[in-house]
Amino acid sequence: QLSLPSILPNENEKVVQLNSSFSLRCFGESEVSWQYPMSEEESSDVEIRNEENNSGLFVTVLEVSSASAAHTGLYTCYYNHTQTEENELEGRHIYIYVPDPDVAFVPLGMTDYLVIVEDDDSAIIPCRTTDPETPVTLHNSEGVVPASYDSRQGFNGTFTVGPYICEATVKGKKFQTIPFNVYALKATSELDLEMEALKTVYKSGETIVVTCAVFNNEVVDLQWTYPGEVKGKGITMLEEIKVPSIKLVYTLTVPEATVKDSGDYECAARQATREVKEMKKVTISVHEKGFIEIKPTFSQLEAVNLHEVKHFVVEVRAYPPPRISWLKNNLTLIENLTEITTDVEKIQEIRYRSKLKLIRAKEEDSGHYTIVAQNEDAVKSYTFELLTQVPSSILDLVDDHHGSTGGQTVRCTAEGTPLPDIEWMICKDIKKCNNETSWTILANNVSNIITEIHSRDRSTVEGRVTFAKVEETIAVRCLAKNLLGAENRELKLVAPTLRSELTVA
């Protein structure tokens, strides 16, 4: 483990002459950093630099070119990669005083004059002198207040609510601080914090807006953490709403967003007592340009049964919001002329669901359907083929005589989707054809009988069976069947000899 860094000069505190320069050197076994009293804006005359030396140690020098009262305070050197937020900053400290006959007290920010006390707890009124030897007294409306004083911290004690003034005398000259206002605050166990981001998806160039609202609490510190924070990209605003109840609305605006602004946007509200903290976060994504993704929940070849009601659902992810349309066979779907409807519903911020609904499927609903989603940056489409499945039906069953040869052909025309299969059966004993057991399937390999099949179009098929010679009356059955159903028709074939006898008669 690393031993604590060391500081030169090796002292707990040091008094530095006004307007003089001073430097502090920190030595460590790893990279070291300085924490010092002034804020970033005030520290223009503080220079931090790394120094090479041959000791093998890391050396960081803090240099102040012209010391002022504002440089009075605690300087801490620490290992910058080993600190965790919950522990006190661990390092070496040196306290620097810069006495100024015209500035008895170290300048403070306005918030430092607000001292919040929680439930009779002790508090510090932070008036620190620039000279450790300066005597200081604390006063309120009733006179001098007895409290212990430490020039590095201020007055420590249990204070009642109200204004307090620190008073010092330097070379016969009296100095007073502006009043420190002590407020009592009941500790609340919860902070009511709400975050709102109307959008979480953006594209380059747009403005990100996130708000956090704190309810029923006036004394709150709210910090934003977001990807562009280090570059100071965000603009923060505070709006105070007092009616019907207290509400502090903090808004973070990041103009001209880029992909690098993607990430977690977090607001952390802390009660002024610093005891209670609540955090909320939202993940924002910024895309280089708009996008569209289409995700159908069905395949590229779909079937629907005749008269069936069927829905085809397509999920769409898109930003900016897309315009969604449907085509049939590359023509815009005119819904009022058909029993087909489409709708689009927004599921989430960038998720949409479009449905194509067939109310009562008809044969003419078969075709190629296309969903087209487009916005200013992208166009995507998905096409699927729809087949309306129709049960088999026989359109025609006719026979055809071959004249004197005695041959006969039977033609069976059937329709349906999918295309029906045609099967032939014969019954040779015409008197017994009412009995199903008298029927036999006609096999392809029977001599003198030829079966053939031709598809006429996508939904019509013609089957033919040719008998080389019909010597006695037989019955022929055509059976057309597909997935949805079967139909059969029968026909009598009369032998030519019998036919001529009938003709004569």
Epitope: Q1, T82, T84, E85, E86, N87, R270, R274, E275, K277
Partner: antibody, heavy 118, light 107 residues
Amino acid sequence: QVQLVESGGGVVQPGRSLRLSCAASGFTFSSYGMHWVRQAPGKGLEWVAVIWYDRSNKYYVDSVKGRFTISRDNSKNTLYLQMNSLRAEDTAVYYCAGGRSRGAFDYWGQGTLVTVSS
Amino acid sequence: DIQMTQSPSSVSASVGDRVTITCRASQDISSWLAWYQQKPGKAPKLLIFAASSLQSGVPSRFSGSGSGTDFTLTISSLQPEDFATYYCQRTSSFPRTFGQGTKVEIK
């Protein structure tokens, strides 16, 4: 040497409360963020809560938010865990822990068993 | 929240064996990772912090490596007192999630 001693565990009915304490010695307690970690019987370790060295922040695992409160008294070198609305799934050995080694826990107590059962 | 996943969940080994346990974070945690050893009925003990730094007093047969999302604890030559359960933990930000543990058992 460093010592962390937990106390306050015991058997309690669901819905009731219990307060655990952790007495620290042998190190500068007021400079350390302190944590509670628990371990259900036969299960792994689960981080429960943290309180900053100066009480400025507290964080909790989602499953105890709104029911457990971590607090500390730096003048007494003591860490507390107030557990309300206890559930059967809160049954565990509760350890207090802290440390400075890049956020790892150098110091652990011996643990105190909390059993939530009707 | 960042998840920590350890593998294997248990390993059988003999004295003198080299044992390797891995830990994967669901997001980049740089080198903010610690390894602990726990024996039945005892509190965990810190072995490694900052992914590869050996805690003082811990034998040098224990070593840690990795950065970002993938980390490894290695015991170069297993000793009888090393049979225990080992946990990884992310050590920055909150929640300070632990891995589910790896039990090292005697073969």
